[in-house]
């Protein structure tokens, strides 16, 4: 029961972690203007791995997708692909638990063979969540240095009186949702494979056989064999990696109520 | 068509408050902002504020911090503004202007004339 | 706040002929999200509200004439009136649309020569 029950939970996690890599992938806003020294601002620019938007304080937004593969950068395009490769992942291990779960009886397969699926999708689950954490926090990096980097050249032409104020960018909401689901799915991984352990067939010590041999009552114990299945006791020693999540408050950018500027 | 009708001129004390009043027609009244942007005699444009009907939230000019009110009706489509604590230098025309894309105004009301003298 | 500088206060142009007005920002009104600048042109007439010409510097409101166009980037915007009609003869104002409060420049008044 217990051992359902870690699968079950393990799936769900996953299922939620997974769809929340999908949604932080398609999100646009993966990095936001930073509103620091400017809360109530007329024109917010946010981006995301495929487009990048403009929000006026009237209401038009305006976005405008990355036309070019080349143009873009390395890092971004590494971000993309580290995403991609988590949700493929995580959809390829989803398919492959669904069939392995303890619940759902298919054919006649044997609880071996469930075993085997849910390992595998385990492990599925644990690298997309760590691709998800990765891609993440590659562009998290990515922001954290062009922010210094920007507030280092905060104004640029500075000869007279003209200003060129540059914008600079800051976590979006996207990042926080990403590192949550990777995290997530990660933890589902990590369950499915302590449900596994559970799954595989334990060293069975068969019940003594009886002979009767004539004119004697000598029951015969044979030897018991390992049942080989693929999954020895050293799953004792798996470590698990849990991806720590951030989460904060994303800063509003409209006008709120009774904003002076 | 997109009309924004406002009230009647006035004529107050200093120190005294005024509220003008801009009704929309003609289109989504609560999907627009509205700003508010007045004229003294001769003189050029300069911006008070701005309110979202559909929520109420107001943006206002630090110029006239603690002295403007913007409020907005849906049941009327019309909003509202109240200036308070009126000095001779407030003697001006007073537009509302629906707020469009690329921050501009696009429509205008006819303005309304507040007069401030003792 | 972001000054709005216009130039000159007052100009007086034949009728058909070639109309320049001129706004400086104190700050770029250029947005590097969607490289366009946040400038407005409006013109007035005597006893009327303001009314929209071009928006995003060089976008003619729906309804303008062709003859006026507007130009410029980052602190430097140039209305034209290409060939200036006797109901063109108005104030007109430029405005900041990036950077709250928003703010005007003075006014430039056009007359015929």
């Known amino acids: 029961m217990a051992v359902t029950a870690c699968q079950g939970l393990g799936f769900v996690v996953s299922l939620i972690g997974i769809a929340g890599i999908i949604a932080a992938t398609c999100m646009d806003q993966w990095s936001t203007q930073d509103l620091y020294n400017n809360p109530v601002t007329a024109v917010f620019n946010y981006q995301g791995l495929w487009r990048s938007c403009v929000r006026e304080s009237s209401g038009f937004t305006e976005c405008r997708g990355y036309f070019t593969l080349l143009g873009l950068p390395a890092m971004l395009q590494a971000v993309r692909a580290l995403m991609i490769v988590g949700i493929v992942l995580g959809a390829i291990g989803l398919l492959v638990s669904i069939f392995a779960l303890k619940c759902i009886r298919i054919g006649s397969m044997e609880d071996s063979a469930k075993a085997n699926m849910t390992l595998t999708s385990g492990i599925m689950f644990i690298v997309s969540g760590l691709c998800a954490i990765a891609g993440v926090s590659v562009f998290a990096n990515m922001l954290v240095t062009n922010f210094w980097m920007s507030t280092a050249n905060m104004y640029t032409g500075m000869g007279g009186m003209v200003q060129t104020v540059q914008t600079r960018y800051t976590f979006g909401a996207a990042l926080f949702v990403g590192w949550v689901a990777g995290g997530l799915t990660l933890i589902g991984g990590v369950m499915m494979c302590i449900a596994c352990r559970g799954l595989a067939p334990e060293e069975t010590n068969y019940k003594a056989v009886s002979y009767h041999a004539s004119g004697h009552s000598v029951a015969y114990k044979p030897g018991g064999f390992k049942a080989s299945t693929g999954f020895g006791s050293n799953t004792k020693n798996k470590k698990i990696y849990d991806g720590g999540a951030r989460t904060e408050d994303e800063v509003q950018s409209y006008p709120s109520k009774h904003d002076y500027v | 068509q997109v009309q924004l009708v406002q009230s009647g001129a006035e004529v107050k004390k200093p120190g005294a408050s005024v509220k003008v009043s801009c009704k929309a027609s003609g289109y989504a009244f609560s999907s627009y902002w509205m700003n508010w942007v007045r004229q003294a005699p001769g003189q050029g444009l300069e911006w008070i504020g701005q309110?979202?009907?559909?929520?109420?939230?107001?943006t206002y000019n630090g110029k006239f911090k603690g002295r403007v009110t913007m409020t907005a009706d849906k049941s009327t489509s019309t909003v509202y503004m109240e200036l308070s604590s009126l000095r001779s230098e407030d003697t001006a025309v007073y537009f509302c202007?629906?707020?469009?894309?690329?921050?501009?105004?696009?429509?205008w009301g006819q303005g309304t004339l507040v007069t401030v003298s003792s | 706040d972001i000054v709005m500088t216009q130039s000159p206060d007052s100009l007086a142009v034949s009728l058909g002929e070639r109309a320049t007005i001129s706004c400086k920002s104190s700050?770029?009104?250029?947005?590097?999200?969607?490289?366009?600048?946040?400038l407005t042109w409006y013109q007035q007439k005597p006893g009327q509200p303001p009314k929209l010409l071009i928006y995003w510097a060089s976008t003619r409101e729906s309804g303008v004439p062709d003859r006026f166009s507007g130009s410029g980037s980052g602190t430097d915007f140039t209305l034209t009136i290409s060939s200036l009609q006797a109901e063109d003869v108005a104030v007109y104002y430029c405005?900041?649309?990036?950077?709250?409060?928003?703010?005007f420049g003075q006014g430039t008044k056009l007359e015929i020569k």
């Open positions: 202007a629906r707020f469009v894309k690329g921050n501009a105004m696009d429509y």
């Open positions: 700050q770029s009104l250029l947005n590097s999200g969607n490289q366009k600048n946040y």
């Open positions: 309110i979202y009907p559909g929520n109420g939230d107001t």
């Open positions: 405005q900041n649309a990036y950077s709250y409060p928003f703010t």
